[in-house]
Interface confidence: low
């Protein structure tokens, strides 16, 4: 059987919703002595990096400039060491925001309810869409999508503490183009920690999971160096 | 078990102000919102707003917006409601109703009535 | 503001017999609505909760149906003690509203 090295981790740096016409970071971290490494798009070759000294890096960022909808979609990459490929990542979905129109939510009975309460958002999109997506800040990859010709409903069920925080809804022109997003609505759950819209579990900066932890070899330790990222607060 | 003891019958004269309290007992008075509703002679029930005493966030029904004014003190689980420059047709009996998703508990009632 | 509007003002039933009471919204709520049964000179007491959940310590009698815009509060056999008023309450926007009552009287 052919052998093949183990697959890299594909990550989007900040965000993998990309505003239309900003660019896009796409880390693929593989292997120290990785000669090369290739970005695919949607199964197809579109980028190559070549990090010096390979030795010394574990991963390159793929910069792709002025975001639009025909760069969204799903992305993968393999890296190279020697004559030797590696599986393909897992596939990430890079979507593009800003598009055309936004988006307004609501949520009933309302903003502030009790623990136990029945509590149902509501997405509306006046121009043509059919697919809604509602995301919580600080949790973006759970997306939770809904359908409906102007207006979607996201019924939650009985919330508890966990449901507290700000949400924020896109209409969908298709899976990898969204709209702009809504303004933010904050969830408050009587019973929570005074004054508190985010749960003590969510991070302190969206998506800190999508950063791109690529590290350096210096010597005799590895630098756990943020690599000229920057987490935002 | 839950209980809501509202205070007792007010005669006010027109323009004037009533405070109506609403002490709670019987279970966390910060877990669960704090409504209002009045009802005239023989008509039917009519929200006024509510609070939640957590975090004191108020919402009120816009016909009341001005007038009402809902309060808590979590030091004393007593909820407060009090209605400016009175009418007579303020005349009713106004009860403080505890929200979890519906109005499960209410208290006893209030007679306001205002009157020259 | 959504409208609630029950139906008929006044029913009359005679003890034994079955009552179905109408409510109907403005526009959808779902199956946040609520139901409230109100004796002369009392405070309203919670009956159904979001259109069909039954309430601990309401006898199952008590009945309701109904999702989006039309409800409906079903006594299968009335009692001497089921003679009231009885209100729909929307719980799912602000502000929160009633329906103007049903009077169930006894024929």
């Known amino acids: 059987p052919k052998q093949t090295l183990p697959k890299p981790i594909i990550r989007a740096e900040s965000t993998y919703m990309v505003p239309k016409e900003k660019q896009a970071t796409l880390c693929c971290q593989g292997s120290y002595g990785a000669v090369e490494y290739q970005l695919h798009f949607e199964g197809s070759l579109f980028a190559v990096e070549r990090p010096k000294p390979p030795e010394r890096i574990n991963g390159v960022k793929f910069h792709i400039p002025d975001m639009n909808s025909r760069k969204a979609g799903r992305y993968s990459c393999i890296y190279r060491v020697g004559e030797l490929w590696s599986e393909r990542s897992d596939l990430l979905d890079l979507v593009v925001t800003e598009m055309y129109d936004t988006p307004t939510l609501s949520v009933h009975p309302g903003p502030e309810v009790t623990s136990g309460e029945k509590v149902t958002f509501y997405c509306r999109l006046d121009t043509a869409t059919s697919m809604f997506l509602l995301l919580k800040e600080g949790r973006s990859r759970d997306v939770q999508r809904s359908y409906g010709k102007v207006q979607a409903e996201f019924p939650m069920g009985p919330v508890t503490t966990a449901h507290r925080g700000s949400y924020r809804c896109f209409g969908s022109y298709n899976n990898y183009a969204w709209s702009f997003p809504s303004e933010p609505v904050k969830l408050l759950v009587t019973g929570d920690i005074e004054n508190t819209s985010l749960a003590p579990t969510d991070p302190t900066f969206p998506d800190s999971w999508d950063t791109c932890l690529l590290t350096r070899e210096t010597g005799l330790q590895k630098d756990l160096a943020l690599w000229d990222h920057t987490a935002q607060n | 078990q839950v209980q809501l003891v509202q205070s007792g019958a007010e005669v006010k004269k027109p323009g004037s102000s009533v405070k109506v309290s609403c002490k709670a007992s019987?279970?966390?008075?910060?877990?669960?919102?704090m409504h209002w509703v009045r009802q005239a002679p023989g008509q039917g029930l009519e929200w006024i707003g509510g609070i939640s005493p957590n975090i004191g966030g108020t919402s009120y029904n816009q016909k009341f917006k001005g007038r009402a004014t809902i309060t808590a003190d979590k030091s004393t689980s007593t909820a407060y409601m009090e209605l400016s420059s009175l009418r007579s047709e303020d005349t009713a009996v106004y009860y403080c109703?505890?929200?979890?998703?519906?109005?499960?508990?209410w208290g006893q009632g209030t007679t306001v009535t205002v009157s020259s | 503001e959504i409208v609630m509007t029950q139906s008929p003002a006044t029913l009359s039933v005679s003890p034994g017999e079955r009552a179905t009471l109408s409510c109907r919204a403005s526009?959808?709520?779902?199956?946040?609505l609520h139901w409230y049964q109100q004796k002369p000179g009392q405070a309203p007491r919670l009956l159904i909760k979001?259109?069909?959940q039954s309430i601990s310590g309401i006898p199952a009698r008590f009945s309701g149906s109904g999702s989006g815009t039309d409800f409906t509060l079903t006594i299968s056999s009335l009692e001497p003690e089921d003679f009231a008023v009885y209100y729909c309450?929307?719980?799912?926007?602000?502000?929160?509203?009633f329906g103007q009552g049903t009077k169930l009287e006894i024929k």
């Open positions: 979001y259109a069909s």
């Open positions: 309450q929307n719980g799912h926007s602000f502000p929160l509203t």
């Open positions: 019987g279970y966390t008075f910060s877990e669960y919102t």
């Open positions: 109703a505890r929200r979890g998703g519906s109005f499960d508990y």
């Open positions: 526009q959808s709520i779902s199956d946040y």
